[in-house]
């Protein structure tokens, strides 16, 4: 067992050119808080993953201001170390995320608003009970400065912790294969703590809280005898040949504990033993509970209420995230219909719609034609979120009020004259050609490309076009 | 101008199920979470469960067995149904909105008077 | 889950004169996550205070909210005649979501 500490000595601007505008204004106070989380392993993991080693929160740092027309300082920090203990052997290499957190203090709506202002992660090996070491990390145009190390909570004591030592009790020496702590020589190595109820007399461990069988011995807690001697596989398949009686696979084969967790069999199943910081069944919650206020921007915590369960944020309309730490662009949804224009006002989304549409989302079709009248007889069609008059002949323009020329289109063919005329046109067909609009040619031998003509209509009589 | 209108029988029989319905007008449905709160004559306001209109639904554990909130987006409504009623689900229930700054109240109903009796 | 006790039960004051209203939470509220809201006899509550300390809008500046943590104060600093009603407070730190039992503000 232990604590990894972290002190951050400094968050302001990194060298070099394109210095940031100070997160801080005289309109909007701020202060800075941060967040570390720490990963076993050289893991590459995402941001969201667990931090199966521990996350701490730091206090919030004092309230800013910003001088106007300086530069953005170094921030003012918050007082104190971020602390992660952990309950277990301390892996030697570990990843980390630090994230700086602004709390902005202005008149907002709902309370203070948080957003994430910058996130380093980085990967390191570090031995407990080493000094301290120093680290600088940039993000985007800010830096971090800042120191980490791990040490050991007594009694534990080593590069991974898991060393246990105690007060000598003789003045001279340590017990039988006992060995002097350094650098602690005034205690002694304590012998290693196997796991509860491990067989003192067919058992052993060689680290804290296993349990490894002597031969002939089997189950986790080395009390199950083996029929024969010559069962030296502990776990293997029961042999015909040899007659040996071994348990199958046993619930805590593969450790199904999460986050360094160790399992014990019970009588239906089996139990783990959790790491402090983490809960549930298989350790796999981590131990943030709704106490911490883990949820930002107006977000509820919900669950969470004791450690043993996990927390979920419900986060307001307009953020997202794990812990509602993030704005939605939530124009990018396309939620406006019928090619109505987004605006993503903060507290509300509004659509602004098209002619012809209407809704919180421009979702309903207006009628168009409703209070329009085509002039003289046309009929109104809808389309498109705008209305169109289908006019009666001899008329035209957007509601049939003008009177048309119907023959300004030049509608009969092959040189035939046109006339109006009060119900439509008459195409007067130049000679060889018939048809409403002269289109058809009349054939030398009397025959047109036509049915036989209506009696008392002769080729090249005018045709009307009705 | 958003308001809110409940609607719904007033008298329950004890072990029925009670079922109101929430209009919603001046507001999307689809841009707030919408609430259910009660009110028993005389007493104090007892938060009864929250939906999202992506289904996203959160109830009081003292009520969480018994009660279902709906969402429909088309009717701009939602709706609350509480089974196996009992003299003391007896209250005025109301329909709130959910602020987009937190989980409190900015608009209600005028609220609807439940009794349940046989 | 936050129990929040309200104090004191009754408040009997003249117009004109100061109310101080009490909400002590079982456990901290984080971010000031606290609302109250003023109810009349036969209509729905209504919100006056959001984030501990901001208004509503519409809601006179008579009207002012304080606090933190675990204890917090909503402060009418002249009684109006249509001030005297049942005051709730309300978190919305983490779920359950919970009310205070009132305090009614009733004319002497």
């Known amino acids: 067992a232990g604590v990894f500490e972290l002190q951050i000595h400094s968050f302001g601007p990194g060298p070099g050119p394109g210095a940031p505008r100070s997160p801080c204004s005289a309109r909007l106070p701020c202060r800075l808080f941060f967040r570390v989380c720490l990963k076993p392993g050289l893991s590459e993991e995402a941001a969201e993953s667990p931090c199966a080693l521990g996350a701490a929160l730091s206090a919030r740092g004092p309230v800013y201001t910003e001088q106007p027309g300086a530069p953005a300082p170094d921030l003012p920090l918050p007082d104190g170390l971020l602390q992660v203990p952990f309950r277990d052997a301390w892996p030697g290499t570990f990843s980390f995320i630090i994230e700086t957190w602004r709390e902005e203090l202005g008149d907002q709506i709902g309370g203070p608003a948080w957003s994430l202002l910058a996130r380093v992660a980085g990967r390191r090996r570090l031995a407990a009970g080493g000094p301290w070491a120093r680290d600088i990390q940039r993000a985007g145009a800010w830096e971090l400065r800042f120191s980490y190390r791990a040490r050991c909570e007594p009694p534990a004591v080593g590069t991974a912790c898991t060393r246990l030592c105690r007060p000598r009790s003789a003045p001279s020496r340590c017990g039988p294969g006992l060995r002097p702590c350094a650098p602690l020589e005034d205690e002694c190595e304590a012998p290693l703590v196997c796991r509860a109820g491990c067989s003192p007399e067919h058992g052993f461990c060689e680290q804290p809280g296993e349990c490894r069988c002597l031969e002939g011995w089997t189950g986790p807690l080395c009390t199950v005898p083996v029929s024969t001697s010559s069962c030296l596989s502990p776990r293997g398949p029961s042999s015909a040949t040899t007659g040996c009686l071994v348990p199958g696979p046993g619930p805590c084969d593969g450790n199904p504990c999460a986050n360094g967790g160790s399992c014990s069999e019970t009588p239906r199943s089996f139990e783990c033993t959790c790491p402090r910081g983490f809960y549930g069944l298989r350790c796999e919650v981590s131990g943030v509970t709704c106490a911490d206020g883990p949820c930002f921007n107006g977000g509820l915590c919900v669950g969470g209420a004791d450690p043993d369960s996990a927390y979920i944020c419900h986060c307001p309309p307009g953020f997202q995230g794990s812990n509602c730490e993030k704005r939605v662009d939530r124009c990018s949804l396309q939620p406006c219909r019928n090619g109505g224009l987004c605006l993503d006002l903060g507290h509300a989304l509004r659509c602004r719609c098209r002619a012809g549409f209407a809704g919180p989302r421009c979702e309903h079709d207006l009628d168009d034609c409703a209070g329009r009248a085509c002039a003289n007889g046309g009929t109104c069609v809808e389309g498109g979120g705008a209305h169109r008059c289908s006019c009666a002949l001899g008329f035209g323009g957007r509601d049939c009020r003008e009177r048309a020329d119907p023959c300004a289109a030049r509608p009969c063919a092959h040189g035939g004259r046109c006339y109006a005329h009060f119900s439509g046109l008459v195409c007067a067909c130049a000679p060889g050609y018939m048809g409403a609009r002269c289109e058809f040619p009349v054939h030398p031998d009397g025959a047109s490309a036509l049915p036989a003509a209506p009696p008392g209509l002769r080729p090249g009589d005018p045709q009307r076009y009705l | 101008q958003v308001q809110l209108q409940e609607s719904g029988p007033g008298l329950v029989k004890p072990s029925e199920t009670l079922s109101l319905t929430c209009t919603v007008s001046g507001a999307s449905i689809s841009s707030f979470y919408w609430s259910w709160i009660r009110q028993p004559p005389g007493k104090g306001l007892e938060w009864i469960g929250y939906i999202y209109y992506s289904g996203t639904t959160n109830y009081n554990p003292s009520l969480k067995s018994r009660v279902t909130i709906s969402v429909d987006t088309s009717k701009n409504q939602f709706s609350l149904k509480l089974s196996s009623v009992t003299a003391a689900d007896t209250a005025v229930y109301y329909c709130a909105r959910i602020a987009v700054a937190g989980f409190f109240f900015d608009y209600w109903g005028q609220g609807t008077l439940v009794t349940v009796s046989s | 889950e936050i129990v929040l006790t309200q104090s004191p039960g009754t408040l009997s004051l003249s117009p004109g004169e100061r109310a101080t209203l009490s909400c002590r939470a079982s456990q901290s509220v984080n971010k000031n996550y606290l609302a109250w809201y003023q109810q009349k006899p036969g209509q729905a509550p209504r919100l006056l205070i959001y984030?501990?300390?901001s208004r509503a809008t519409g809601i006179p500046d008579r009207f002012s909210g304080s606090g933190s943590g675990t204890d917090f104060t909503l402060t009418i600093s002249r009684l109006e005649p249509e001030d005297f009603a049942v005051y709730y407070c309300q978190q919305y730190d983490r779920s359950p979501l919970t009310f205070g039992g009132g305090t009614k503000v009733e004319i002497k």
């Open positions: 984030g501990a300390s």
